[in-house]
């Protein structure tokens, strides 16, 4: 029962995590304009992996996609790649784990096969989570570097009458979504790996004891059914657990004002 619960919970946590990774990858708020030294701006800039946006105080929001591939910074390309790899691995992991769930019966699939699949999906979730965390961390590091570079530039060459305030960017909501989502996927993957151990019971070798009765030769083998870990062994006695795992995936929608027609 504990194994099923661990597996089910691992699946749910990973599912939420991967949904979060997808959401973070699609979000536009990877970096947002730093308002610390400029709280009076009437124009707010924010950027994602795929496009940059400008929101005016009038509510008009304009987003422009990065239509160039070669002109983009290598770090941004790397972050994109890490996030996509994370999503792909996570999606495959989810697909594998669905079939591996102990509470789902598919034909006459053995526990050993399910254990294998659980381990595979768990590893995939762990790698997926690590990809997301790495991607978000690389982007965050890029932001920190650029932030201090632009801060240094802000306080040089200000001798003239005209002030040119450089736009600085800080961490956007997507980074925090990505970190949390990556962490959840990682935790889910670990839980799946733990569940795998419980799904594959150890081989127990029972020695057959022969009782010789007068007139009849009866061989008696103690033990209800043989527990096996051998791949390809046919375990007939299976306990089916009705796992009622539910996912409540709350998607937060940001209320953007309006676009002019």
């Amino acid at each position: 029962m504990a194994v099923t619960a661990c597996q089910g919970l691992g699946f749910v946590v990973s599912l939420i995590g991967i949904a979060g990774i997808i959401a973070a990858t699609c979000m536009d708020q990877w970096s947002t304009q730093d308002l610390y030294n400029n709280p009076v701006t009437a124009v707010f800039n924010y950027q994602g992996l795929w496009r940059s946006c400008v929101r005016e105080s009038s509510g008009f929001t304009e987003c422009r996609g990065y239509f160039t591939l070669l002109g983009l910074p290598a770090m941004l390309q790397a972050v994109r790649a890490l996030m996509i790899v994370g999503i792909v691995l996570g999606a495959i992991g989810l697909l594998v784990s669905i079939f591996a769930l102990k509470c789902i019966r598919i034909g006459s699939m053995e526990d050993s096969a399910k254990a294998n699949m659980t381990l595979t999906s768990g590893i995939m979730f762990i790698v997926s989570g690590l990809c997301a965390i790495a991607g978000v961390s690389v982007f965050a590091n890029m932001l920190v570097t650029n932030f201090w570079m632009s801060t240094a530039n802000m306080y040089t060459g200000m001798g003239g009458m005209v002030q040119t305030v450089q736009t600085r960017y800080t961490f956007g909501a997507a980074l925090f979504v990505g970190w949390v989502a990556g962490g959840l996927t990682l935790i889910g993957g670990v839980m799946m790996c733990i569940a795998c151990r419980g799904l594959a019971p150890e081989e127990t070798n029972y020695k057959a004891v022969s009782y010789h009765a007068s007139g009849h030769s009866v061989a008696y083998k103690p033990g209800g059914f043989k527990a096996s870990t051998g791949f390809g062994s046919n375990t007939k006695n299976k306990k089916i657990y009705d796992g009622g795992a539910r996912t409540e995936d709350e998607v937060q929608s940001y209320p953007s004002k309006h676009d002019y027609v």
Epitope: T41, A42, V43, N45, E56, S57, S58, E62
Partner: antibody, heavy 118, light 113 residues
């Protein structure tokens, strides 16, 4: 079409308060900011502040913040600008305006003349 | 606050001639995020509210005659009327739409010579 209709001219004594209204029509009132702009005789236009009727959020020019209050009644599609502790330099035409692309003002009320005189 | 300075204070141009007026801001109005300048031009005739002519420094509002054009970037902007018409006599204002508080120039009064 978008229309902003303001209340009529007001004559007030120094120290009193005035409340100017701006009734909007022809668009979704809760979707756009309503700004208030002052134009004193022979002076440049001065932005006083705005309200976003969708949530009642306001933003004021620090110069007027202590004395101006901008409100909105969404059921009546009307914005209000109240100016307190009136003085002679508050004699001006007050415009309400709806914002547009580039944080510009595309639609204006006809203006309300407020005269502060003892 | 961003200070907007217009020049000249008044301008007299013959009908059919080109009219040019300038607007300078104390800070750059160029937004790096979309490479747009948050400067607006208005026309105001006596007894009327201002009328929007140009936003984003160079985008003409619909219904505004194409003889009106805006140019410039950063801190220096220009409004040009290619061929002055009698109905163009008015006061022209520029406005900062980049930072709060929004500020206006003192205006340029355009007259017919």
């Amino acid at each position: 079409q978008v229309q902003l209709v303001q209340s009529g001219a007001e004559v007030k004594k120094p120290g009193a308060s005035v409340k100017v209204s701006c009734k909007a029509s022809g668009y979704t009132f809760t979707s756009h900011n309503i700004h208030w702009i002052k134009q004193a005789p022979g002076q440049r236009l001065e932005w006083m502040g705005y309200i976003y009727p969708g949530n009642g959020g306001t933003n004021y020019n620090q110069k007027f913040k202590a004395r101006v209050t901008i409100t909105a009644d969404t059921s009546a599609s009307t914005a209000y600008m109240e100016l307190s502790s009136l003085r002679s330099e508050d004699t001006a035409v007050y415009f309400c305006a709806r914002d547009y692309y580039g944080n510009s003002f595309a639609y204006w009320g006809q203006g309300t003349l407020v005269t502060v005189s003892s | 606050d961003i200070v907007m300075t217009q020049s000249p204070d008044s301008l007299a141009v013959s009908l059919g001639e080109r009219a040019t007026m300038s607007c300078k801001s104390s800070q750059s109005l160029l937004n790096s995020g979309n490479q747009k300048n948050y400067l607006t031009w208005y026309q105001q005739k006596p007894g009327q509210p201002p009328k929007l002519l140009i936003y984003w420094a160079s985008t003409r509002e619909s219904g505004v005659p194409d003889r009106f054009s805006g140019s410039g970037s950063g801190t220096d902007f220009t409004l040009t009327i290619s061929s002055l018409q009698a109905e163009d006599v008015a006061v022209y204002y520029c406005q900062n739409g980049y930072r709060f508080p929004f500020t206006f120039g003192q205006g340029t009064k355009l007259e017919i010579k």
